[in-house]
């Protein structure tokens, strides 16, 4: 068995680090899937929702074959940082409707922060540049209405779910190339 959770890993084997990142990503994916289902149950979604400030999906079935580790990790970190900002915004701006999901949203934020720390560690171990590529940060304005914040929540959780789903596939594929 590996070291206890939370203890520093002595080994700097990138494959073991990737395994750890995949495990955290899978765990966050399960949380996101569960919360998205809870959202649909509490606040039925009328069709697909989008949010201009969310990152566009970085990976697709066509791009999986050409993935390179530095690019994937950098882009994944940038996208997840954007999702973290959106989850923080939801928790603050969502109003009473979304406060009913507060324990779960808080846990999701904590897991997302943990995964970002793990990715940062992995990138430093692989001597990859930490700086995120220059990208304009779109300020997140107030939701137009409570209904609007619910639509935004559907979009954020749906987008995060897709991003994490591709992240797991991409990281697993990259592990085989190490």
């Amino acid at each position: 068995p590996g070291p206890p959770a939370g203890s520093p890993r002595v080994s700097s084997d990138p494959r073991a680090d990737l395994d750890s990142a995949v495990l955290l990503t899978r765990s966050l994916l399960a949380d996101t899937r569960q919360l998205a289902a809870q959202m649909r149950d509490k606040f039925p979604a009328d069709g697909d929702h989008s949010l201009d400030s969310l990152p566009t999906l970085a990976m697709s079935a066509g791009t999986l074959g050409s993935l390179q580790l530095p690019g994937v990790l950098t882009r994944l970190r940038v996208d997840l940082m954007s999702y973290l900002r959106h989850v923080q915004w939801l928790r603050r701006a969502g109003g009473p409707s979304l406060k009913t999901l507060e324990p779960e949203l808080g846990a999701l934020q904590a897991r997302l922060e943990r995964l970002l720390r793990r990715l940062q560690l992995l990138m430093s171990r692989l001597a990859l540049p930490q700086a995120a590529p220059d990208q304009p940060v779109i300020p997140l304005g107030p939701p137009a209405s409570a209904w609007g914040s619910i639509r935004a929540a559907h979009a954020i959780l749906g987008g995060l779910h897709l991003t994490l789903d591709w992240a797991v596939r991409g990281l697993l594929l990259l592990k085989t190339r190490l």
Epitope: K42, F43, R91, R92, A93, G94, G95, P96, S97, K99, T100, E102, G141, P142, P143, A144, S145, A146, W147, G148, S149, I150
Partner: antibody, heavy 117, light 110 residues
Amino acid sequence: QVQLVESGGGVVQPGRSLRLSCAASGFTFSHYDMHWVRQAPGKGLEWVAVISYEGSNKFYADSVKGRFTISRDNSKNTLYLQMNSLRAEDTAVYYCARTPGSHFDYWGQGTLVTVSS
Amino acid sequence: QSVLTQPPSASGTPGQRVTISCSGSSSNIGSNYVNWYQQLPGTAPKLLIYYDNLRPSGVPDRFSGSKSGTSASLAISGLRSEDEADYYCAAWDDSLSGVVFGGGTKLTVL
């Protein structure tokens, strides 16, 4: 333009009940969470209750929990506050307020409730 | 006693800059947006600042909001006689599951 008009206030004896209404117009009522806020004579603002846009989630201040009930009828664009077991300390101007998220962007003019024997 | 703490009164002369403080905790100001409301004598409150530091359309840029940790403040520059009113800070409180207000600050323009 957005309008919120409260009604139903008046003089009532301690222990009795009263129902306040807030008629909304000028916006899509069913898209907004709605609050009741009160202000005792010469005192500050006190939050009373909130109901989510579709009516399923409600939160109350400890001071009114178990006595007051917030509700809404989206087909009538109306918000309600059912006040039971009224006490002297419930005497106040009651305002309804609209919220797009974390702030009250529009307020009604208020309706005065006086609880006195 | 209010959950958010404001000075009961503040004053200034026309043209001056006045600041009103609002102190809270990690469960309200520390983790949620702060809003400020102005209540002119005999009228309903009006939104003045939301999202910590944003102004609704129609509110002069003489009014500004800021936040640091568990405290917030409202600044009014170029004070005018029509600014004489009660000012309230407010925020959602995660522990109480509700909105909390400051006790209000009565601003007098001397």
